[in-house]
């Protein structure tokens, strides 16, 4: 029964004389183990014995026993499942069917596998992709129908004869499906390999030949050229004529169409091999190429260089950078158009020419304020001298110089004058757009560059000016040197240092604190009255008559300056004492008399003492003494005694007369 | 070869005038730059006054302004300094001196004529 | 504008003389140093800060940043005995600006 017995293994398995077979096979017994084994060779049924006749292999049974020249043939399997057989070495004549007869314990079963044993060995088979095209990496895939544990074998790759650089990949199959080994080789063609053989060598384990396949390669690629160019330099001079030929030395598939470029850029009507320039230009100086397509795509050839020759053009001057700030680097270019490149240059400033540089590029590290101007150049080759092109401006530029502060004013300038000061310079670029004054003041500036300062102060010492363009250039200082009528004149007390008494030495100074010009006059004065020209006030002795306002006056010839009213006073005794009496000295009796201390004295009297004609001092301390009513007995002489700081001063005697009354008369 | 004679020095009295020239040779004159520097006795260099090719950019040191002038005559390769006024400072060996307009650097000199201010 | 110079520098043969020219900001200017020796005139040495003009060895160098530069002089001969001005343009007063000199002595 066909179902219970499933059998896997390759259908054919190919070798030769003298190598050996490795036959990979599984098997499914359903109804038990695997109790007996033949192996057949070109197996057929008998009918009548109901068994198959043939050459017996192997044979395998119950009691184990195998005869001794099966030693051949080896059964790798077991009782279930792997029927694996190996025969080695293997004949000729073992070409054609395996049988294997399997029995197990109610069920038989003969599978065939075919042999094909060859007298030498086979030859691989190489694959390649449908096509190839240069520079497209391809596998080329080396295949042989054979691998066997036994007999290890090695696939090698030929190129015209030379083994390939190239690792191949050596693969190979001993599985129930497939029995091969297999070499793959990774390669990319260039268009020099169309045409070659390429080769899969069969070798055995010692490297000795054993088969091999061949193929010629089929390399699809773009024409490849040639360009051949007379004068083979490619160098002419303008007027002259060059021919460039262009050369296919190989295209697959043929080529289709024929171009010429130059400068990348195709040319016009010039469609065949050869490209013919008649009394070149210089404007034809290029890299020219032939360009020739076939089915793959345009090949181009070399590029050949073709430098027309010319003296140079009329130059330009190229500066970087201008304008320029004087100090700073500056590089001059000169560019002209030549073939071959200028070898010399000459420099022109200003239209006349510059020594000791003759170079394309000229570099000044710190330009100079001379250096500005108009630069030309003019360039030279072998073929002759250029033309001085347009010139180029160099602009240096700088803050103002010599900046000076000059006052317009004639001299001297007095306090309370307008002062005009103007602000100039030497030069300037870019141009002085403003000016800046120091210190700063409410000023006017009626014009660019011009400050007027009305009303000077005496204070007003000095100005500096600024112009100023991109930068400012500050002037030195310049003195306005103010005149102005003496300052700040009061009168000081030199001695003595404490308070002016009666009969001291005192000095007064007469102070001032500056004047402009220095030289100065002094007077003093008192009540309108002129005591001095001195610039100190002396008294030898000071008397309370000297006590009064004093002013000193100052002046210079700008003006005079008085100080403020100084009061001098003079402290001394009581003085010019006397005793007055009111309503007079002689009074009725029973009347009011009054006595008045009259004084003179600094500080006034601050205590007075009354004295009668005993000299016994009255028991009254004020300035005036009141007697009422008087009496005759108040008569007789009295007088009065001052104090103050300073001492005591003391009147003469005064008499008082006191009358009867008429009354008193008429009662006597 | 570049060359630079100075010549019309000599002894002056304070006050007085004297025209210093200088002849040169062996270059294009025309094409450079010109100066004037003195060397008063045992002292160092000090800038007198230079000239542009031309003749149209002219710089005094402070100190001779306004008595001194520059001049060239390129037709007879010539410099001169014309020098009035003069004072017993001035007493110096003057020398002409070629300048390089690209560096500003003087790159030849003369030998010098001296300048004796003295009564 | 003052360029300063030490009036004298000393050194043996074959040693590196080092003079220096101070200013303000010096290293702004274009420095040319002059080489006198007694009873000649100048000679140009070192021209834009560091370049030397044909004829003058390769011993003699300058450099020039801030407010000093120098003019150095490597494997000091007899014959380097000189006096050493520089110079420089002062753009703010349009005036030529000499060093004071240092006299170089090789002992």
């Known amino acids: 029964d066909s179902s219970k017995w499933v059998f896997e293994h390759p259908e054919t398995l190919y070798a030769w004389e003298g190598a050996c077979v490795w036959i990979p096979c599984t098997y499914r017994a359903l109804d038990g183990d695997l109790e007996s084994f033949i192996l057949f060779h070109n197996p057929e049924y008998n009918k009548n014995t109901s068994k198959f006749d043939g050459t017996r292999l192997y044979e395998s049974t119950k009691d184990g026993k195998v005869p001794s020249e099966q030693k051949r043939v080896q059964f790798l399997g077991d009782k279930n499942k792997n029927c694996t057989l190996s025969i080695h070495p293997v004949h000729l004549n073992d070409s054609g069917q395996l049988g294997l007869r399997m029995e197990s314990k109610t069920e038989k079963w003969m599978e065939r596998i075919h042999l094909n044993v060859s007298e030498r060995p086979f030859p691989p088979h190489i694959q390649l992709p449908p096509e190839i095209q240069e520079s497209q990496e391809v596998t080329l895939t080396c295949l042989l129908n054979f691998s066997c544990y036994g007999y290890p074998i090695q696939l090698q790759w030929l190129l015209e004869g030379v083994p390939m650089r190239q690792a191949a990949v050596t693969s190979t199959s001993l599985t129930i499906k497939s029995v091969f080994t297999r070499s793959e080789l990774k390669f990319s063609p260039q268009w020099s390999h169309h045409g070659k053989i390429v080769t899969c060598q069969l070798q055995d384990a010692d490297g000795k030949f054993l088969s091999n396949d061949t193929v010629q390669l089929n390399v699809k690629h773009t024409p490849k050229l040639e360009i051949k160019v007379t004068p083979s330099d490619a160098i002419v001079r303008e007027g002259d004529s060059v021919t460039m030929t262009c050369e296919v030395s190989s295209s697959n598939p043929e080529y289709t169409t024929v171009s010429w470029l130059k400068d990348g850029t195709s040319l016009k009507k010039q469609n065949t091999f050869t490209l013919n320039l008649r009394e070149v230009t210089k404007d034809q100086s290029g890299k020219y190429c032939c360009q020739v397509s076939n089915d793959v795509g345009p090949g181009r050839s070399e590029e050949v260089f073709l430098q027309v020759q010319y003296a140079p053009e009329p130059s330009t001057v190229q500066i970087l950078h201008s304008p320029a700030v004087e100090g700073s680097q500056v590089e001059f270019l000169c560019m002209s158009l030549a073939n071959p490149l200028p070898t010399n240059y000459t420099w022109y400033h200003n239209g006349k020419e510059m020594q000791g540089r003759t170079e394309e590029k000229v570099h000044i590290p710190k330009i100079l304020p001379w250096h500005a101007g108009t630069y030309s150049c003019v360039a030279e080759n072998i073929l002759g001298t250029g033309q001085r092109g347009p010139g180029a401006e160099l602009d240096v530029q700088y803050p103002p110089k010599k900046v000076t502060t000059v006052i317009q004013n004639p001299m001297p300038i007095r306090e309370g004058d307008t002062v005009t000061l103007s602000c100039n310079y030497n030069s300037s670029n870019p141009s002085v757009t403003r000016y800046e004054w120091k210190p700063h003041g409410a000023w006017e500036e009626p014009s660019l560059g011009v400050l007027k300062i009305q009303n000077v102060g005496w204070d007003n010492t000095t100005i500096a000016c600024a112009a100023c363009n991109s930068w400012c250039s500050w002037a030195s200082p310049v003195a306005l040197n103010v005149q102005y009528a003496p300052r700040d004149v009061r009168v000081r007390k030199i001695k003595p240092l404490s308070e002016i008494h009666s009969g001291n030495s005192v000095s007064l100074q007469c102070d001032f604190s500056s004047s402009h010009p220095k030289e100065v006059q002094f007077f003093w004065e008192k009540n309108g009255r002129l005591l001095g020209k001195e610039s100190q006030l002396n008294f030898d002795s000071i008397s309370p008559e000297d006590a009064g306002s004093y002013s000193c006056w100052v002046n210079n010839s700008i003006g005079q300056t008085a100080s403020k009213a100084w009061t001098l006073e003079v402290l001394y005794a009581p003085r010019r004492l006397r005793v007055s009496m009111s309503p007079g000295d002689q009074v009725m009796e029973g009347k009011s008399a009054t006595l008045t201390c009259e004084s003179d004295a600094n500080p006034p009297v601050s205590h007075y003492t009354w004295f009668d004609w005993n000299n016994q001092s009255l028991p009254y301390h004020s300035q005036k003494l009141r007697l009422e009513p008087v009496k005759v007995q108040h008569s007789g002489a009295y007088w009065c005694q001052g104090t103050n700081s300073v001492g005591k001063g003391r009147s003469p005697l005064s008499t008082l007369t006191v009358y009867y009354s008429p009354e008193t008369i008429g009662r006597r | 070869e570049v060359q630079l004679v100075e010549s019309g020095g000599g002894l002056v009295k304070p006050g007085g005038s004297l025209r210093l020239s200088c002849a040169a040779s062996?270059?294009?004159?025309?094409?450079?730059?010109m100066s004037w520097i003195r060397q008063a006795p045992g002292k160092g260099l000090e800038w007198v006054s230079y000239?542009?090719?031309?003749?149209?950019?002219?710089y005094y040191a402070d100190s001779v302004k306004g008595r001194f002038t520059i001049s060239r005559d390129n037709a007879k390769n010539s410099l001169y300094l014309q020098m009035n006024s003069l004072r017993a400072e001035d007493t110096a060996v003057y020398y002409c001196?070629?300048?390089?307009?690209?560096?500003?650097?003087?790159?030849?000199w003369g030998q010098g004529t001296l300048v004796t201010v003295s009564s | 504008y003052v360029l300063t110079q030490p009036p004298s520098v000393s050194v043996a043969p074959g040693k590196t003389a080092t003079i220096t020219c101070g200013g303000t900001?010096?290293?702004?200017?274009?420095v040319h140093w002059y080489q006198q020796k007694p009873g000649q005139a100048p000679v140009l040495a070192i021209y834009?800060?560091?370049d030397r003009p044909s004829g003058i060895p390769e011993r003699f160098s300058g450099s020039n940043s801030g407010n000093t530069a120098t003019l150095t002089i490597s494997r000091v001969e007899a014959g380097d005995e000189a006096d050493y001005f520089c110079?420089?343009?002062?753009?703010?007063?349009?005036?030529?600006?000499f060093g004071g000199g240092t006299k170089l002595t090789v002992l």
């Open positions: 001196a070629r300048d390089d307009f690209w560096s500003g650097s003087v790159d030849y």
């Open positions: 062996g270059f294009t004159f025309s094409d450079y730059y």
């Open positions: 000239i542009s090719s031309s003749g149209s950019t002219i």
């Open positions: 900001n010096i290293g702004s200017k274009n």
């Open positions: 834009y800060d560091s």
């Open positions: 110079q420089v343009w002062d753009s703010s007063s349009d005036h030529w600006v």
